[in-house]
């Protein structure tokens, strides 16, 4: 079972090699497609592959901000041919992510499939970590091999890689071993209660609030830090402001997502910039304590 | 693993009907046009007809035209040939393929016109 | 319709040889040709996409070149396995395959 996710591909290329996909959709180049053309080829070692974010079956959705459907193979194709005179194209692709079914905590392997100089898609942190202390996943490229498997998210702790222990491992060295793994990856995660923000822990509730703005402020001031796995808190509400009069905002709620994306290991300046871009229709994920110890 | 399974061949007198069947696994069948393909004894390879991945469009080779229908249930994986008015001259192994590369082809299934 | 003629219709050769078809569209199809391989009673397989793709799995003494209306299919050094009957196809209007064109040994 999967679920279907865009993001965003930017690749560099030149004229002579191009970008290293082919494309195909519809039945014949000069007809209008129903439905976007598929990658059916990416070459190895090209752009399209060293990105380490399409893989064969992706649906392309625009070509440098022009959508493909409607328009013809032999259109798409030409976009192309003319993003490769100019070095670079911009993608906007749809994937399948598989619904993995997994435990919100405890520990499990999980095996990705690695070529030698594409990126997985893990970021790890060694962020105020103490001696002894795992190293933690805090961010996951969207669209990378690791954000496909369904089964990995930013707080998840890394024991080990290919059954090499990473319990006194300087991130640098994590990093590395992750590089020149080919063909097959084998993670050991843990995952932890307190990392799941979907699991109501005792005595808090989640739920989303939509917010719109009608061209005015949000009237919430957020606080937290660049650490990526601290929390992000509403500090303040303007009197009278549009947070306030909802009456479902309050200071001391954590922010969980900003228009459905997480803040899970998004340091204070992702959630600023979240908000703003977020448009004029804002949807909060709060989660609130019901129970605050005296 | 790509897999195209062709069902439905016969034997059918002239004037007669039949329709094809096409079982798709291994990819999303919703995603890829589709081609029905047909080869008469000893000769070459003939386009039939062809339909977009959601089914909106649909072509057809113009010996075909009026009397074969090209359809798919995106659902059960399936692309269907419904063949009305049969002749003699549409005796052929008929098969399936993907894309508009014709990528992947069923193993084929035999119709015989004849009375 | 755009129509494809392939040349030659038939064709001896010896393993070794380095072998080549043509194919020639009525008009011009940018690098839309397919080429396609099949044997007695199987399905035809693609060899070669996008005129000059050379499919997964394929081996690499096949390739394709052209562009426009003219296309050749090389095979570098035949194999046993090659004797078989090679199809051009155009994808850029509504599908046509060339005629065919049988290798047999030599």
């Known amino acids: 079972i999967v679920h279907t996710e865009t993001t965003e591909v930017v690749l560099c290329g030149d004229p002579l090699s191009g970008f290293g996909l082919q494309l195909q959709g519809g039945i014949f180049a000069t007809e209008t497609l129903s439905s976007p053309p598929l990658v059916c080829f990416i070459e190895p070692d090209s752009p399209a592959e060293r990105c380490g974010l399409l893989q064969v079956g992706d649906r392309v959705l625009s070509i440098n901000g022009i959508a493909t459907e409607d328009g013809t193979m032999e259109e798409a194709n030409q976009l192309l041919r003319d993003a490769a005179l100019a070095h670079k194209v911009v993608l906007e692709v749809e994937f399948d992510v598989a619904e993995s079914v997994i435990p919100s905590s405890g520990t499990f392997h999980v095996k990705l499939p690695k070529k030698r100089s594409v990126e997985l898609g893990i970021t790890i942190s060694s962020a105020s970590r103490k001696r002894g202390e795992p190293l933690i996943i805090s961010d996951i490229k969207k669209g990378s091999v690791a954000h496909r498997t369904g089964t990995l998210e930013p707080g998840d702790k890394l024991l080990a890689i290919d059954n090499i222990r990473l319990d006194n491992c300087p991130m640098e060295d994590a990093v590395q071993i992750l590089r020149q793994c080919e063909d097959l990856v084998k993670l050991k995660i843990r995952k932890d209660e307190d990392n799941s923000d979907e699991l109501e822990t005792t005595g808090a509730v989640s739920y989303t609030v939509e917010l719109k703005r009608y061209g005015g402020p949000l009237g919430i001031t957020i606080s937290g830090t660049e650490e990526p796995f601290d929390p992000i808190v509403i500090s303040g509400l303007t009197k009278r402001g549009l947070a306030e009069r909802t009456g479902a905002i309050h200071v001391g709620d954590r922010i969980l997502a900003i228009n459905n994306v997480s803040l899970k290991g998004r340091p204070l300046s992702e959630a600023i910039h979240l908000l703003q871009v977020a448009g004029e229709t804002v949807t909060l994920k709060i989660k609130k304590q019901l129970d605050r110890p005296l | 693993e790509v897999q195209l399974l062709e069902s439905g061949g016969g034997l059918v007198q002239p004037g007669g009907s039949l329709r094809l069947s096409c079982a798709a696994s291994?990819?999303?069948?919703?995603?890829?046009?589709m081609s029905w393909v047909r080869q008469a004894p000893g000769k070459g390879l003939e386009w039939v007809s062809a339909i977009s991945g959601s089914g909106g469009s649909t072509y057809y080779a113009d010996s075909v035209k009026g009397r074969f229908t090209i359809s798919r249930d995106n659902s059960k994986n399936t692309l269907y040939l419904q063949m009305n008015s049969l002749r003699a001259e549409d005796t052929a192994v008929y098969y399936c393929?993907?894309?508009?590369?014709?990528?992947?082809w069923g193993q084929g299934t035999l119709v015989t016109v004849s009375s | 319709d755009i129509q494809m003629t392939q040349s030659p219709s038939s064709l001896s050769a010896s393993v070794g040889d380095r072998v080549t078809i043509t194919c020639r569209a009525s008009q011009s199809i940018s690098s839309y040709l397919n080429w396609y391989q099949q044997k007695p009673g199987k399905a035809p397989k693609l060899l070669i996409y996008?005129?000059?793709s050379l499919q997964s799995g394929v081996p690499s003494r096949f390739s394709g070149s052209g562009s426009g209306t003219d296309f050749t299919l090389t095979i570098s050094s035949l194999q046993p396995e090659d004797f078989a009957t090679y199809y051009c196809?155009?994808?850029?209007?509504?599908?046509?395959f060339g005629q065919g064109t049988k290798l047999e040994i030599k």
């Open positions: 291994g990819f999303t069948f919703s995603s890829y046009a």
């Open positions: 996008a005129a000059s």
């Open positions: 393929a993907r894309g508009s590369y014709m990528d992947y």
């Open positions: 196809q155009q994808s850029y209007g509504p599908p046509t």
